[in-house]
């Protein structure tokens, strides 16, 4: 079953390489183990930035290795990904699946731009 | 054109095991994740265990975990769900499901195998 994700349309990640957004979903119902997975669009490609899954009212559990971290809040999701360079500059999409209790839900939103501009090295101060 | 073509089903007594495979044909395929999903008579679809190519990475609804293994052969394009301590309330008709990427949702179906467990 489908459900509308909704996020920004543009984010500029800060001079140390962080970009937050806000991915908000409209639950049909009441979930109560919801996953969360942020893919990344560039150049017609498609990978998987990190996923996380959390219990409604509980902090979500990324990977170990992951550069995402999020708190979620009611039918939102606060998401910062960390450590992001220039080259990494595309299109992040918010993918909201609503696992339990049945049915299952699945929604996409239509993507955040997230800029990043590598800040320009310190001169020499001779 | 994409099909999932699913078979193992049958019916068990319960504590039993069975082994589902889900096997893609048409074309070479690169899946981002290949999942099963189950629907009882009267009942809404259920989430059952997904596995994604990314890392490998498996997912599995609370009423499976432990009992249930998902696992996927890329070189054969299929997809297997091993079912182990099954129950009663295991029996549905399970389907299986694949994503070619993460931002396209479950793009192809099977038509799904019934799984009877009985007391």
């Known amino acids: 079953k489908a459900m509308h994700v909704a996020q920004p349309a543009v984010v500029l990640a800060s001079s140390r390489g962080i970009a937050s957004f806000v991915c908000e979903y409209a639950s049909p119902g009441k979930a109560t183990e919801v996953r969360v997975t942020v893919l990344r669009q560039a150049d017609s490609q498609v990978t998987e930035v990190c996923a996380a899954t959390y219990m409604m009212g509980n902090e979500l559990t990324f990977l170990d290795d992951s550069i995402c971290t999020g708190t979620s809040s009611g039918n939102q999701v606060n998401l910062t990904i960390q450590g992001l360079r220039a080259m990494d500059t595309g299109l992040y999409i918010c993918k909201v699946e609503l696992m339990y209790p049945p049915p299952y839900y699945l929604g996409i939103g239509n993507g955040t731009q997230i800029y990043v501009i590598d800040p320009e090295p310190c001169p020499d101060s001779d | 054109e994409v099909q999932l073509v699913e078979s193992g089903g049958g019916v068990v007594q319960a504590g039993g095991s069975l082994r589902l495979s889900c096997a893609a044909s048409?074309?070479?395929?690169?899946?981002?994740?290949m999942g099963w999903f189950r629907q009882a008579p009267g009942k809404e679809q259920e989430f059952v265990a997904d596995?994604?190519?990314?890392?490998?990475?498996?997912y599995y609804a609370d009423s499976v975990k432990g009992r249930f293994t998902i696992s996927r052969d890329n070189a054969k394009n299929t997809v297997y769900l091993q079912m182990n301590s099954l129950k009663p309330e295991d029996t549905a008709v399970y389907y299986c499901?694949?994503?070619?990427?993460?931002?396209?949702?479950?793009?192809?179906w099977g038509q799904g195998t019934q799984v009877q467990v009985s007391s």
């Open positions: 048409g074309g070479t395929f690169s899946f981002y994740g």
């Open positions: 596995i994604r190519t990314s890392a490998g990475r498996t």
């Open positions: 499901a694949a994503e070619m990427s993460g931002i396209s949702g479950w793009d192809y």
